[in-house]
């Protein structure tokens, strides 16, 4: 499964919101019930946010993250990180599993 993220780092100012873009190409007949979406800190694998069994499982990252639920069915797995802090800087991995799976990492820089 191909998962796309921007090659360039996402740059955000402290205190603002950042969108970590991630997308995949759903096959015809794709249902959200089939989707496992896991956002993690790339190096430690710490859970950030997840979607499974047709439901948003919520933020595991200081309650400052959100998905775009209305866009998931179209293959938009992007993550919104609110009130960015200096400590948020680093790499986030978007892991998507339907029948097959794939993952890609996006870098966040805090200015």
């Amino acid at each position: 499964l191909e998962v796309q993220v921007p090659e360039d780092p996402v740059v955000a100012l402290v205190g603002t919101d950042a969108t970590l873009c991630c997308s995949f190409s759903p096959e015809p007949g794709f249902s959200l019930a089939q989707l496992n979406l896991i956002w993690q800190l790339t190096d430690t694998k710490q859970l950030v946010h997840s979607f499974a069994e047709g439901q948003d499982q919520g933020s595991a990252y200081a309650n400052r993250t959100a998905l775009f639920p209305d866009l998931l069915a179209q293959g938009n797995a992007s993550l919104r990180l609110q009130r960015v802090r200096v400590a948020d800087e680093g790499s986030f991995t978007c892991f998507v599993s339907i029948r097959d799976f794939g993952s890609a990492a996006v870098s966040l820089q805090v200015a």
Partner: antibody
């Protein structure tokens, strides 16, 4: 459907370097996936060694980090493991596997014995 | 690193019986971050369950996973002859990814 196949010497001398290659077929190694090495020994069970992404980014198990190198050759659709300064404790079945979280599929595994 | 402890070490059952395998993690993890594998002699492990309860492609529905926090369970509702094997749990909520030591399900 992706298939993996390990290859390399089955016998390595103590203090030498273990070198294995994993050939990927049925799909491109350049896709959005991490490629891993896992080993299995009677003493330590299943142990993750490390992973590589097609960009060349690597992550290694802290316990093996000082001795491990994983590389990727996209032109040959394969990735490789090098483990140096081996001892008898490195005797194990070595598997390659795909995945950032869970592992699927796996290669069939290759037994590497460290002995003089 | 997170240590996974599986119990029992060996489970002796007859075909048709129900098998219940336990996996305990040394730290609490989200259920979405646990997988189960089956391994038969001379073969590589095969993914059975991911996300604690989602069956991998081609896995029969007699296999089911459940649990949360530190306690997870793999259940096989009615053992078939081909189910006698070793089963491993694995966590991917913390690096390095780690496995349990395995539970052997053998024919009684």
């Amino acid at each position: 459907q992706v298939q993996l196949q390990e290859s390399g010497p089955g016998l390595v001398k103590p203090s030498g370097t273990l070198s294995l290659t994993c050939a990927v077929s049925g799909g491109s190694i350049s896709t959005s996936n991490y490629w891993n090495w896992v080993r299995q020994s009677p003493g330590k069970g299943l142990e993750w060694i490390g992973e590589i992404y097609p960009t060349g980014n690597t992550n290694y198990s802290p316990s093996l980090k000082s001795r491990v190198t994983i590389s990727i050759d996209k032109s040959k659709n394969q990735f490789s493991l090098k483990l140096n300064s081996v001892t008898a404790a490195d005797t194990a079945v070595y598997y390659c596997a795909r995945g950032y979280n869970w592992f699927d599929p796996w290669g069939q595994g290759t037994l590497v014995t460290v002995s003089s | 690193e997170i240590v996974l402890t599986q119990s029992p070490g060996t489970l002796s059952l007859s075909p048709g019986e129900r098998a219940t395998l336990s996996c305990r993690t040394s730290q609490s993890i989200n259920a979405i971050l646990l997988a189960w594998y089956q391994q038969k002699p001379g073969q590589a492990p095969r993914l059975l369950i991911y996300g604690a309860s989602s069956r991998a492609t081609g896995i029969p529905d007699r296999f089911s996973g459940s649990g949360s926090g530190t306690d997870f369970t793999l259940s096989i509702s009615r053992l078939e002859p081909e189910d006698f094997a070793v089963y491993y749990c694995q966590q991917y909520g913390s690096s390095p990814r780690t496995f349990g030591q395995g539970t052997k399900v053998e024919i009684k």
